[in-house]
């Protein structure tokens, strides 16, 4: 069951998944310049069995002016986007290799891919957030969101984190000073 | 269930100071911030600021700072609004508020100053 | 500050009535918007927030929309219990601002 709505927006955070439960569909979407080729699918989806879980189909960009040349899904080093190593993003890197199961990791990126990743979430998927650079969480209670089912709706939790730009914190005298945060995910996603 | 619960009524002379409190219940006091909001006749709903439960670092309304104080007693599972040097102007309906949706609101404390 | 201008101030309507509630920021609030709804000598209830999400609980008559700048909350078939004061708030910065509020009275 697809989730109705997006994750929930979160002041100055961004939101990404660790792993995709089966069902999820990610848009082949392509950046200026080019489109998904003729014959290629509108989305990859993440299908499996009981033992493993992939993402089915490939996404292929081609220019939108040369017709005939198609690009590989493999992508050349230097297309890769540049990922800052945070906290979190090695979390997610332990997450990828502990697969869990009915779940796709992240896909690989592919050639000239458009720089925001749509995801179509299913019930039961959980996003987590994190301030964006430049902003601390001020509050971190449940930083994540679970789409679920209720009375024949879907909904997606609140999650309890609030970040903000100012620097200094306001503490009253005698509290310990909060961990500092990571500063912000390796990429935000959305969701349509 | 959820519940903030705030004391309804309080008469202070002008010039005191008056902590305000709002005890968490029926939740995990910790996982959700707790705003304060007063409510007066001349001003509608103000914002006052956002207190972590968990840290106690707070954030707060420019318009309220050197008036307002807010602090959490997390073995308690409460929050406080001291206010300070009162005037007759900071009579008003103060409210407890939680998360980032204010989900919850605690009943409000009704301030009156007057001598 | 952003400025949250609500529209109308007042408005009376009839149970079973349509009616909707227009808020406006002076800047861009995107979606972080909230919609409560508050009862004479009660608190504020929340309703709507992230502009269209329906709190839990709230009855599938009341509906919020927009982003950006402009904001409404509508209510189809109106029940006895819905009449009250309205007002929206902005969470994109602090500090956060409510609207001036709409009464909402019984024709």
């Known amino acids: 069951e697809l989730c109705d709505d997006d994750p929930p927006k979160i002041t100055h955070a961004t939101f990404k998944a660790v792993a995709y439960k089966e069902g999820t569909m990610l848009n082949c979407e392509c950046k200026r310049g080019f489109r998904r080729i003729k014959s290629g699918s509108p989305y990859m989806l993440c299908t499996g069995n009981s033992s493993h879980s992939s993402w089915d189909n490939q996404c292929q960009c081609t220019s939108s002016a040369a017709r005939n040349t198609t690009k590989q899904v493999t992508p050349q080093p230097e297309e890769q986007k540049e990922r800052k190593t945070t906290e979190m993003q090695s979390q997610m890197q332990l997450a990828d290799q502990v697969s869990l199961p009915g779940h796709c990791r992240e896909p690989p990126p592919w050639e000239n891919e458009a720089t925001e990743r749509i995801y179509h979430f299913v019930v039961g998927q959980t996003v987590y957030y994190q301030c964006v650079q430049g902003y601390r969480a001020l509050h971190r209670g449940p930083a994540e969101s679970v789409c679920k089912m209720t009375h024949g709706k879907t909904r997606w939790t609140q999650p309890q984190l609030i970040c903000t730009g100012e620097t200094e914190p306001s503490q009253f005298p005698g509290e310990e000073e909060p961990q500092a945060s990571p500063d912000g995910l390796p990429e935000s996603e959305t969701s349509r | 269930q959820v519940q903030l619960q705030q004391p309804g009524a309080e008469l202070v002379r002008p010039g005191v100071s008056l902590k305000i409190s709002c005890k968490g219940s029926g939740y995990t006091f910790t996982d959700y911030a707790m705003h304060w909001v007063r409510q007066s006749h001349a001003k509608s709903l103000e914002w006052i600021g956002v207190i972590s439960t968990y840290s106690g670092d707070a954030l707060y309304n420019q318009k309220f700072k050197g008036k307002a104080t807010m602090t959490v007693d997390k073995s308690s599972s409460t929050a406080y609004l001291e206010l300070a040097r009162l005037t007759s102007e900071d009579s008003a309906i103060y409210y407890c508020?939680?998360?980032?949706?204010?989900?919850?609101w605690g009943q409000g404390t009704t301030l009156t100053v007057s001598s | 500050d952003v400025v949250m201008t609500q529209s109308p101030a007042s408005l009376s309507a009839s149970v079973g009535e349509t009616v909707t509630i227009t808020c406006r920021a002076s800047e861009n609030s995107y979606s972080y918007l909230e919609w409560y709804q508050q009862k004479q000598g009660k608190s504020p209830q929340l309703l709507v927030y992230?502009?269209?999400t329906l709190a839990e609980g709230v009855p599938s008559r009341f509906s919020g929309s927009g982003s950006g700048t402009q904001f409404s909350l509508k209510i189809n078939s109106l029940q006895p219990e819905d009449f009250g004061t309205y007002y929206c708030?902005?969470?994109?910065?602090?500090?956060?601002?409510f609207g001036g509020g709409t009464k909402l009275e019984m024709k």
């Open positions: 508020a939680r998360g980032v949706t204010f989900d919850y």
């Open positions: 708030q902005h969470h994109y910065g602090t500090p956060y601002t």
């Open positions: 992230n502009a269209k």
